[in-house]
């Protein structure tokens, strides 16, 4: 069948007024204009550039589409450069919008804007709008747009002005046919052929089912005036889950997948994964196996590691060192780390609770890359269980039971806590009597207390100590009129506790006459 142009509308061929619908009436107006040959014709123009938010619609009469499936709309228009209109740069636009509305019959004079489908925003060719400011060159632009395929008996075209200075010189609607073909996995539909300005019309193809455009290489063909397809450019490629077979994309078979359209062929599922349906873009993991979110589809599914091996420990009073060997099975992954769970257990029934936040871990509790850790600040004489778990990138995806190595220990005796409530009971010229309270946590039997004292201005460069078994003592042989600093700590078999906070005490000044000085209460005297 010979290709043929079928005119549905040609505004230039109409000698009388076009009488299209303009809404609002103050928008588009029908005037006598000139075509490219300066022949008078009927045109529509609008130039509402002063006010913002323009919405001026112009609608053609109803166009019967005949046998057409796809329609060619050729617009010739003159658009005035906004720079040629002083003082309107904020409100002036240089585009307009082209719409269509399909219907089986003439719906009357009302333009129901919401029913219209936008075809495109039409702009003048850049070289046409660039004109000398003082000599505003206004050239004829030709823009062609395709609409369809159309399903109803006819349609309206509509032109929406949003604030441009524009004249529609010619509106031509027609169709021609190049028969639909499939090339490079793209369907090229029944298409209008070249207009009188060119022998070839470039047409963009639509990818076949389950195909998509290759990046930055969309499929195009040229429909000649003779109705033949020429010069294919670009292509479609089969989507993920599909591979090319002739002019179609077929789904990958069972046990195969294709994760990206960029891959040419379907591939067999990676280890520990499967696909039990056709058209898979990735394979599902077998039970007990997982993919981390960052794992690409082509890597094998993996599982959590087994428990660490050869867990050993070493206790030093209230500090425990743990050490272990890597798990026998890393689950097929190289991102194994370790985490420690500490539980404190009661003496009876072995009930355990998490240790809480006052326990210290060196270097850290979770995300351990080395196979050792030191746990500090445990309670003395307490039962603890430590679980050491190996973790990898899929451990948190697994719902199965955790695999860990565990060890239970009892801590030794800890040093006593700090002495509190140190008070000066009596202050004389050469002696001071102090009392204090037993530590809150003796952590064993207190064998003695040690009192450290020194002259304040000596700043601990030289100091003396005094030991006592009771919670009070008298410190003798002091200098009169001198400020001393006193600190006291408790001693047990486990070692020394921390010193109490400093207590400053000033001895009395020496009297001019000889005065009686009472003897110290404490039976323990300072060594001379």
């Amino acid at each position: 069948q010979a290709a043929k142009e079928v005119l549905l509308l040609d505004s230039k061929a109409q000698q009388t007024e076009l009488e299209w619908i303009s809404s609002p009436p103050s928008g588009w107006e029908e005037i006598s204009g000139l075509d490219e040959n300066y022949t008078p014709i009927r045109t529509y123009q609008v130039c509402q550039v002063m006010e913002p938010n323009q919405n001026n619609w112009l609608r053609t009469n109803w166009i019967s589409k005949g046998n057409a499936q796809r329609i060619f709309v050729e617009l010739k228009f003159t658009l005035r450069d906004c720079n040629s209109l002083p003082g309107v740069l904020g409100t002036c636009k240089e585009t307009f919008n082209l719409y269509y509305y399909e219907t089986d019959y003439d719906t009357g004079r009302n333009i129901r804007e919401n029913l219209y489908v936008k075809i495109d925003t039409i702009a003048a060719d850049e070289s046409f709008t660039q004109g000398d400011l003082g000599e505003r060159k206004m050239k004829l632009n030709t823009e062609v747009r395709e609409i369809g395929p159309l399903s109803k008996k006819g349609f309206y075209l509509a032109f929406q002005d949003v604030g441009a200075c524009i004249a529609l010189v010619s509106v031509k609607v027609y169709y021609k046919k190049c028969w639909s073909i499939v090339e490079n996995l793209a369907v090229f539909p029944d298409t209008v052929t070249g207009s009188e300005f060119s022998s070839l019309v470039e047409v963009r193809g639509t990818c076949v089912s389950s195909a998509e455009e290759e990046a930055e290489n969309s499929p195009r063909m040229h429909c000649s005036a003779e109705g033949e397809w020429l010069v294919p450019i670009g292509k479609c490629i089969c989507k993920a889950g599909y591979q090319q077979k002739g002019d179609t994309c077929e789904p990958c078979g069972r046990r195969f997948y294709k994760s990206s359209s960029q891959d040419l062929q379907c591939s067999r599922c990676p280890t520990h994964s499967f696909s039990d349906r056709e058209g898979s873009s990735r394979c599902e993991c077998e039970d007990g196996y997982y993919r981390a979110p960052s794992d690409p589809p082509y890597v094998a599914c993996t599982r959590p590691p087994s428990a660490p091996q050869n867990l050993i420990f070493n206790i030093n009073q209230t500090t425990v060192s743990l050490e272990w060997s890597p798990p026998a099975d890393n689950g097929g992954r190289n991102d194994v780390t370790y985490r420690i769970l500490c539980k404190r257990c009661s003496w009876e029934q072995g009930e355990c609770v998490p240790c809480g936040s006052n326990i210290g871990y060196m270097p850290q509790q979770t995300g351990l890359e080395d196979n050792y850790v030191t746990v500090m600040d445990l309670l003395a004489h307490a039962n603890y269980t430590f679980e050491v778990e190996a973790v990898n990138g899929v451990s948190d995806l697994s719902r199965s039971q955790r695999l860990f190595a565990a060890v239970s220990i009892t801590t030794g005796q800890a040093a006593p806590s700090q002495v509190s409530g140190v008070m000066k009971e009596r202050v004389l010229q050469r002696s001071v009597q102090l009392s204090w309270q037993e530590p809150e946590h003796p952590n064993g039997v207190i064998t003695e207390y040690e009192i450290k004292y020194y002259e304040k201005d000596q700043r601990e460069r030289t100091y003396s100590t005094l030991k006592t078994k009771s919670t009070s003592a008298s410190i003798n042989n002091l200098k009169p009129g001198t400020v001393y600093v006193f600190q006291i700590r408790a001693v047990t078999a486990a070692g020394y506790g921390n010193y109490s906070p400093r207590l400053d005490v000033a001895t009395l000044e020496e009297a001019s006459g000889k005065m009686f000085e009472a003897t110290a209460v404490s039976s323990e005297q300072n060594p001379v």
Epitope: S26, G33, L34, P40, M50, E51, G87, R136, C165
Partner: antibody, heavy 121, light 106 residues
Framework: QVQLLQSGAEVKKPGASVKVPCKAS????????MSWVRQAPGQGLEWMGW????????TYAQGFTGRFVFSLDTSVSTAYLQISSLKAEDTAVYYC??????????????WGQGTLVTVSS | EIVLTQSPATLSVSPGERATLSCRAS??????PPWYQQKPGQAPRLLIY???TRATGIPDRFSASGSGTDFTLTISRVEPEDFAVYYC????????FGQGTKVEIK
Amino acid sequence: QVQLLQSGAEVKKPGASVKVPCKASGYTFTSRAMSWVRQAPGQGLEWMGWINTNTGNPTYAQGFTGRFVFSLDTSVSTAYLQISSLKAEDTAVYYCARVRLTVYGDGMDVWGQGTLVTVSS
Amino acid sequence: EIVLTQSPATLSVSPGERATLSCRASQSVSSNPPWYQQKPGQAPRLLIYGASTRATGIPDRFSASGSGTDFTLTISRVEPEDFAVYYCQQYGSSWTFGQGTKVEIK
């Protein structure tokens, strides 16, 4: 119908000021620019400039900067021409004219009746 | 600035005759200038603008043509009410008028 109404004749002394109103009716005032045109006695037309009635932005022709000010009161659809430091050579009929912008060309499609300003000591 | 020169300064015609008024620009302008008619004691009136478009209410005996620098207003058959002064105008970066052509009764 569309109309531009200007005030009556004004007689002013040199150095004085005058403010000529131009009241628009019959259309949306802010949709069209307003031009001002001067015609001295027995002379031709001189375009003074225009004002964008939507933004209030004025454009002055050469020779009409400084003493000449275009302004608006959109609430009463009125454009104003103010001339300060009047000189004897400012004696003329001053017209306001609505600007018609089209793709093919511009023009002034509606004119006020003109206000004669006479500057004389 | 573009200067418009109108000729002749005065054109004497009889009613019913054809009148041709010229407007020449000092440099090329891309679109036809608008034309105005002014009768004594009256404000100017827009006759033709743009691509030879007659303003509302202007009879079809008025037409305009030309391109580049030379433009013409033609009154095909002059009527008594057509005797007036006619101005052309250019609308480049600044608008200017020609000095006018007076059409008088012969």
